[in-house]
Interface confidence: low
């Protein structure tokens, strides 16, 4: 049915879906706090611009009786049920914030008359790529894939003189929502990553992974996995690892590597960690003080979603344009707006751009050090440490195939 939008005459409402099934196990109260903090900032910015309007959020909760797995498995129906609730109440805001699960976002996008923008903290999967009115504020799988291909092909750095064309991918099905979709993208036979690699095998059992570490007949020296150091330790323990094995540990939403007192455990010496640049941490923020690093990124994406809406609202109001139009719904892309802790850039498809950081463990200091950074906005790698103190021979990353000479 046609739902009227509470989005005119100086009153602008944001519909926030508070779903029990979520990409990260974050208490809904924390997300509410993030949204409310965002609203305060937006009101201040609009007031400073001389725009005397009201901006509020309506939090839409599901009943939690049917969809209570807590993760994303039953999110498809929960998302549609919440939309039905909005439809029955005949009340929709100018913008929909949430859902975070790929399943629910994909289904909601398919099943709705999208004359309004949808902003998601999550929706990492490839199935949510290239959606005209969807904006994603946490790095989607496509961005990871582009980094990996870029890095695999790189062969002109002092520490990486070989192009790689092979990889193992460890994926055992117990991953968090972000990792699940990142690895899913790498596994998909039609994906850019698979297309660019000559050899790729998915390891699904712990034993398969453990055997590869010392297998002389392995087809690649490179193993991609997703999770934190503890996850790796549970799997690898203190097992011996062949000297030319390189483990790429994708752990994007984790600031712990940058903390001053962190020492890298010995089992991380064969590992390159891919994470996100920690941003403007010198500015201590009140809202993030009680959040763990991962949850901070999730709550921050909700907050930035509010700030993005405020940014677009300001532009449209200043230009005297209508908010309840397809033009507004399609405008949340190809722009940079003022986020909570610095600029946030969205690409042509509404996906957040970021600086990815590849870390290594220094054999001298046992500290994580930045090897290179990658700007997803320009698809460019910037080397940082030109003479890293690697565990690998000659302080260079090995070839991806044992015994193959220079290319």
């Amino acid at each position: 049915s046609q739902v009227s939008q509470n989005c005119h005459n100086g009153s602008y409402e944001i519909s926030v879906l508070m779903m029990g099934n979520s990409a990260f196990a974050e208490p809904l109260k924390n997300l509410e706090d993030a949204v409310n903090e965002g609203l305060e900032i937006v009101r201040g910015r609009l007031q400073n611009a001389g725009l005397n309007v009201t901006v509020n959020a309506t939090f839409m909760y599901s009943d939690g009786l049917i969809h209570n797995s807590g993760d994303c498995r039953s999110s498809t129906c929960e998302g549609l049920d919440l939309l039905r609730k909005i439809s029955n109440a005949q009340r929709m805001g100018c913008v929909l914030i949430g859902p975070s699960c790929t399943y629910s976002t994909f289904q909601m996008y398919l099943d709705t008359e999208l004359s309004y923008p949808m902003i998601s903290a999550g929706s990492f999967g490839l199935s949510c790529d290239y959606k005209e009115t969807l904006t994603r504020l946490m790095s989607p799988a496509r961005k990871l894939m582009y980094f990996l291909v870029n890095f695999w092909k790189t062969n002109d750095l002092p520490f990486k003189t070989y192009s790689w064309s092979t990889s193992y991918v460890y994926k055992n099905g117990t991953e968090t929502e972000d990792c699940f979709w990142y690895l899913n993208a790498l596994e998909a036979s039609v994906s850019y990553f698979s297309h660019e690699l000559g050899f790729k095998v998915v390891l699904r059992q712990d034993k398969e992974f453990q055997d590869i570490l010392m297998d002389h007949n392995r087809k690649s020296n490179v193993i991609i996995m997703c999770g934190g150091p503890e996850f790796l330790y549970k799997l690898k323990g203190d097992r011996a690892v062949a000297e030319d094995i390189v483990i790429i540990l994708v752990d994007l939403f984790n600031d712990q590597y940058f903390e001053d007192n962190v020492t890298a455990p010995d089992y991380m010496k064969n590992v390159l960690v891919l994470t996100l640049s920690p941003g403007n941490s010198l500015l201590n923020s009140s809202f993030s003080r009680n959040l763990s690093p991962t949850k901070r990124d999730f709550a921050l994406a909700y907050l930035n979603g509010i700030l993005l809406f405020g940014h677009m609202l300001k532009i449209f109001l200043e230009n005297g344009e209508n908010i309840t139009t397809p033009k507004f719904a399609h405008a949340f892309r190809n722009l940079t707006f003022e986020g909570y802790d610095g600029p946030v850039t969205l690409d042509d498809w509404g996906d957040v751009d970021s600086t990815m950081v590849l870390l290594y463990t220094s054999v001298d200091t046992k500290k994580y050090k930045v090897l290179l950074t990658y700007d997803t906005h320009v698809n460019k790698t910037y080397p940082v440490d030109m003479s890293p103190t690697f565990t690998w021979k000659n302080s260079k990353l090995p070839n991806d195939i044992t015994g193959r000479g220079p290319q």
């Epitope: 940058f258 640049s277 600029p343 600086t355 930045v370 906005h377």
Partner: nanobody, 115 residues
Framework: QVQLVESGGGLVQPGGSLRLSCAAS????????MSWVRQAPGKGREWVAK????????YYVDSVKGRFTISRDNAKNSLYLQMNSLRAEDTAVYYC????????WGQGTTVTVSS
């Protein structure tokens, strides 16, 4: 390669002025916050000032407020620190830093305030 090169330090009398410069290269300078950090002899690094990517917000440590001014020129990929009313306790090696990565530091530029 990401590089930061500081210049402009020197010996100055108390009450005098200096202008430090930092030339940045190897990253998209105009998208990142920049900072000045200093390290006095025998002490740890101390954050001095920080400026937003477009120059619209600036933050200072209390001890330099009203005396130091941070600025930037994105067209030239340059960061500046204007230091007035210098005191003996401002003596230090001054470094510029970027939020692009915390692992890159220049060689620093030495400021000595002494009569």
């Amino acid at each position: 390669q990401v590089q930061l090169v500081e210049s402009g330090g020197g010996l100055v009398q108390p009450g005098g002025s200096l202008r430090l410069s930092c030339a940045a290269s190897g990253f998209n300078f105009g998208r990142y916050w920049m900072s000045w950090v200093r390290q006095a002899p025998g002490k740890g690094r101390e954050w001095v000032a920080k400026i937003k990517y477009d120059g619209s917000e600036k933050y200072y440590v209390d001890s330099v407020k009203g005396r130091f001014t941070i600025s930037r020129d994105n067209a030239k990929n340059s960061l500046y620190l204007q230091m007035n009313s210098l005191r003996a306790e401002d003596t230090a090696v001054y470094y510029c830093a970027t939020d692009f990565t915390r692992d890159v530091w220049g060689q620093g530029t030495t400021v000595t305030v002494s009569s």
